[in-house]
Interface confidence: medium
């Protein structure tokens, strides 16, 4: 049995920030789980992780330099990404693993969400393209 994930097909980050909600066909209440958001068709970049534990506070972190926060619902995790760059426009996939209690569960690959980052500066100078992140 696999967990099904629903995501918006497309989101636009007008102010370099976006809320991406991952909705699961599974109730995460009193479960130990690891929800993550991945960038790219090959999901090569792990953007943000939300680690949930029935006995401890929610842990949210990024090992890849993204500014992220996370919020937990009964059957959802919402990732809040800030300070996105235009060149981080890409497809983003939600993933989930439930480690405890058994059985171990993970998700069917979702369709992903295209996040279109529209920067504050609409016409950046080609001579000064600005900073870039992975």
């Amino acid at each position: 049995n696999k967990i099904l994930v629903k995501q918006s097909p497309m989101l636009v980050a007008y102010d370099n920030a976006v809320n991406l909600s991952c909705k699961y066909s599974y109730n995460l209440f009193s479960r130990e789980f690891r929800a993550s958001l991945h960038k790219g068709l090959d999901s090569a970049v792990e953007v943000c992780v939300v680690y949930g534990n029935y006995s401890q506070q929610l842990q949210v972190y990024s090992k890849t330099g993204f500014n992220c926060d996370g919020k937990l619902g009964n059957e959802s995790v919402t990732f809040y990404l800030q300070n996105l760059y235009v060149n981080q426009t890409d497809i983003y996939f939600c993933k989930i693993e439930v480690m405890y209690p058994p059985p171990y569960l993970d998700n069917e690959k979702s369709n992903g969400t295209i996040i279109h980052v529209k920067g504050k500066h609409l016409c950046p100078s080609p001579l000064f393209p600005g900073p870039s992140k992975p």
């Epitope: 049995n1 696999k2 993550s36 059985p103």
Partner: antibody, heavy 124, light 107 residues
Framework: EVQLVESGGGLVQPGGSLRLSCAAS????????MSWFRQVPGKGLEWVSV???????HYADSVKGRFTISRHNSENTLFLQMNSLRTEDTAVYYC??????????????????WGQGTTVTVSS | EIVLTQSPATLSLSPGERATLSCRAS??????LAWYQQKPGQAPRLLIY???NRATGIPARFSGSGSGTDFTLTISSLEPEDFAVYYC?????????FGQGTKVEIK
Amino acid sequence: EVQLVESGGGLVQPGGSLRLSCAASGFTVRSNFMSWFRQVPGKGLEWVSVIYSGGSTHYADSVKGRFTISRHNSENTLFLQMNSLRTEDTAVYYCARHGISGTTSYYYYGMDVWGQGTTVTVSS
Amino acid sequence: EIVLTQSPATLSLSPGERATLSCRASQSVSTYLAWYQQKPGQAPRLLIYDASNRATGIPARFSGSGSGTDFTLTISSLEPEDFAVYYCQQRSNWPPTFGQGTKVEIK
């Protein structure tokens, strides 16, 4: 180089205690799921305990209440405190890291790094 | 707990031959099954994860298949270094469990 090195095994009497250590290099213990396994020589493998990156711990029924898994983040070391040891705890003990798949990015798929093992003998 | 039964207990083959090892679970483990190789005096080595994915650095002669309750590890052409004990392990249910092992020995 990614490596795990166990120590702390030895001969102990029934009812005694031992503390096993597992020093990691090349990766960070606290960012990974880490488990202890054991193997009676010539027999199969048995999972003993796990500590998740989030800090929670789980145990096999056979050691619950007697063994405690923990980690020392700054020393990048995993521990297994074994109390009230029984003769049936005699085995080679291995620490191992749960792997991260590059293809799916899922966190937990199998034990991809193992220590060399340390022998625990419980006998009077 | 889920019981994994491996067969045969011992497989006697010559280098260059094909080895087929079986692992049967007492209930469905989906594809959450791994295979390990262990040589005397050494720790186990991960070969296959999630039933059919080769771990990093594992030669292409090792392949895994199956889902649900029946799984197979195939070594297409045995090399001298492949003679060892092979274990299957499930992570679908608690606790994680191993099969009793199949010894692949030189005929």
